[in-house]
């Protein structure tokens, strides 16, 4: 057959649908690959052809559009299942062509089963609600196009296994679920079951999403650098390892990029001719506030390195902050030899052993100094 622009398998569109429920799948050509829509293509005399490859098979085969009750049908650029079966799983291809033009793309469709509490291998969208923020809503997702606006479906909402009724702060309102005030206890999976009639049959759509309660913008602050701080001095002798942690707290901010970085003498560490490594760790609170720690490490510090300026910087959508670490070269402590006199050491008279300086403590550092 003649050449066809083959966009391959579009794995970005890993479509998952529930068994025994309707599914409408738009041909991805018009959404992601071509610059014109289906109507334009149809007007130009192009035909949309569908075929598929079953799971664990290599053979492409036509889709059977003559099944009882039109279980699978095509409408414009949409492939309809009313409803799906488990063995509809496979790779589906839509091809747009006429005698002079051809373009096609494949995509995987997975029909999945759910358990009695709506758990399944389905990847769930996450909806973030601000903690103690006032009324917020989630909407039953991906139900557009399944029934006309003249049809009034029934919608039943669940949290986990349980139908939502008599919840203090969560109220079902048709396609929406309203949270009068969101708390950490509202974290979880929420499912809407939409029931609608069509051509003398009743269909159900099940949609689950994860609600995550996060920090409120009302409480958001610019980044806070906990370390380095004014209480810790990094005193080192040349040849020792210098470790300076930069620990920064970031309030949760929707779509904010949190950044932490070090500068040495005003330059990025990569631009300085010294052997520096930086290790980062990130932790999150229950409301997704973030703590980032970047540890700057110089294995064998030189006296030159100990004269440099080490500054930790942090930035979020709320602002930018910086804090310099106090780094010093350690001055070796004088070693005292005390002659014991006055009869105490008549026989031992001057053992010559060094005695630790009681002012400096056993390890010759100030209490708040850091090694």
């Amino acid at each position: 057959s003649e050449r066809c622009d083959d966009w391959g398998l579009d794995t970005m569109r890993q479509i998952q649908v529930f068994e025994d429920e309707p599914a409408r799948i738009k041909c991805p050509l018009f959404e992601h690959f071509l610059k014109f829509n289906y109507s334009t293509a149809h007007s130009a005399g192009l035909t949309l052809i569908w075929y598929w490859t079953r799971q664990d098979r290599d053979l492409e085969e036509p889709i059977n559009f003559r099944l009882p009750e039109n279980r699978i049908s095509k409408e414009k650029d949409v492939l309809w299942f009313r409803p799906t079966l488990l063995n509809d799983t496979g790779n589906y291809t839509c091809m747009l062509r006429n005698t002079t033009y051809c373009s096609k793309v494949a995509f995987p469709l997975e029909v999945v089963q759910k358990d009695s509490c709506f758990n399944s291998p389905m990847k769930l969208p996450v909806h973030k609600l601000y903690i103690e923020y006032g009324i917020q809503r989630i909407t039953c997702p991906n139900v557009d196009g399944y029934f006309p606006s003249s049809v009034k479906p029934t919608i039943t909402w669940y949290m986990g296994c349980y139908k939502i009724q008599n919840f203090n702060n969560v109220i079902p309102e048709g396609m929406n679920l309203s949270f009068l005030i969101a708390f950490i206890s509202n974290n979880g999976n929420y499912t809407c079951v939409v029931t609608y009639p069509e051509n003398g049959r009743t269909f159900h759509l099940t949609r689950t999403l994860t609600v995550k309660v996060v920090g409120s913008p009302k409480n958001a602050v610019p980044p806070v650098i906990h370390s380095p701080n004014d209480h810790v001095v990094y005193e080192k002798e040349p040849g020792e390892e210098l470790l300076i942690p930069c620990t920064v707290y970031f309030s949760f901010l929707m779509d904010s990029r949190n950044e932490v970085w070090w500068t040495i003498d005003g330059k990025k560490p990569d631009d300085i001719p010294i052997d520096v490594t930086i290790n980062e760790s990130i932790s999150h609170s229950r409301t997704e506030d973030e703590t980032r720690t970047q540890i700057l490490s110089i294995k064998k510090v030189t006296s030159e390195d100990l004269k440099r300026s080490y500054v930790c910087h942090a930035r979020s959508a709320k602002g930018e902050v910086a804090k310099a670490a106090t780094v010093k070269q350690k001055v070796p402590a004088p070693r005292y030899t005390v002659e014991l006199a006055c009869g105490f050491g008549a026989t031992g008279g001057g053992s010559g052993k060094p005695i630790p300086n009681p002012l400096l403590g056993l390890d010759s550092t100030h209490h708040h100094h850091h090694h």
Epitope: F18, E19, D20, L85, L86, Q113, K114, D115, S116, C117, F118, T154, T156, Y158, K163, Q165, V193, T195, T202, H204, T206
Partner: antibody, heavy 118, light 107 residues
């Protein structure tokens, strides 16, 4: 196209047990709840409990907790209800009925008549 | 358990009569009430769910209404084939419970 086919009538002795079956076809058996309902003349309808064949999860009406045991076999798309320690009070028509998570019953079996004799 | 009190028990009707059956829940069940029709020797058939939603294939002479504790099922113009027993059921919470039934019989 959805069909629930129940086993035939049963005549059993008091104190014995019985197992009634309900074979489903025309839909994904694993993905809907199967309920059991008791009907005695002049006593209306009583919900016994339900099972989700996909994972075997069950909910029972407390009144029937020690009387009925619900099971399901996914490979044959069949739900079962075992009734134990039978008495004349258990003489009734038993229906299986499907629900899609929503607690109302869109398809019913034809019913199985159980007669308990002393 | 939620008790569903259905009235009347018996309802004598003539063809094309308007029929009203009521069901009262012992506590608030929102709008979660279903109605079934059962003919002699047959299994029940779903007519309405969520109080006012007609199940597919059910003629539009059947309507339902109500919320909270009081529910009404109406047949606007009774046909001979409507002679049957009608049950209400709350599908609000477990255990699911039914009304005692209303038998439509010819006058």
């Amino acid at each position: 196209q959805v069909q629930l086919q129940q086993s035939g009538p049963e005549l059993v002795k008091s104190g014995a047990s019985v197992r009634i079956s309900c074979k489903a076809s025309g839909y994904a058996f694993s993905g809907s709840w199967m309920n059991w309902v008791k009907q005695r003349p002049g006593k209306g309808l009583e919900w016994i409990g339900r099972i989700y064949p996909g994972d075997g999860n069950t909910n029972y009406n407390g009144k029937f907790k020690d009387k009925a045991t619900l099971t399901a076999d996914k490979s044959s798309s069949t739900a079962f209800m075992q009734l134990s320690s039978l008495t004349s009070e258990d003489s009734a028509v038993y229906f299986c009925a499907r629900d899609y998570y929503l607690f109302y019953f869109d398809y019913w079996g034809q019913g199985t008549t159980l007669t308990v004799s002393s | 358990n939620i008790v569903m009190t259905q009235t009347p028990k018996f309802l004598p009707v003539a063809a094309e009569d308007r029929v009203i059956i009521t069901c009262k829940a012992s506590q608030d069940v929102s709008n979660e009430v279903a109605w079934y029709q059962q003919k002699p020797g047959q299994s029940p058939k779903l007519l309405m769910y969520y109080a006012s939603n007609r199940y597919t294939g059910v003629p539009d002479r059947f309507t339902g209404s109500g919320s909270g504790t009081d529910f009404t099922f109406t047949i606007s113009s009774v046909q001979v084939e409507d002679l049957a027993v009608y049950f209400c059921q709350q599908h609000y919470s477990s255990p699911l419970t039914f009304g005692a039934g209303t038998k439509l019989e010819l006058k």
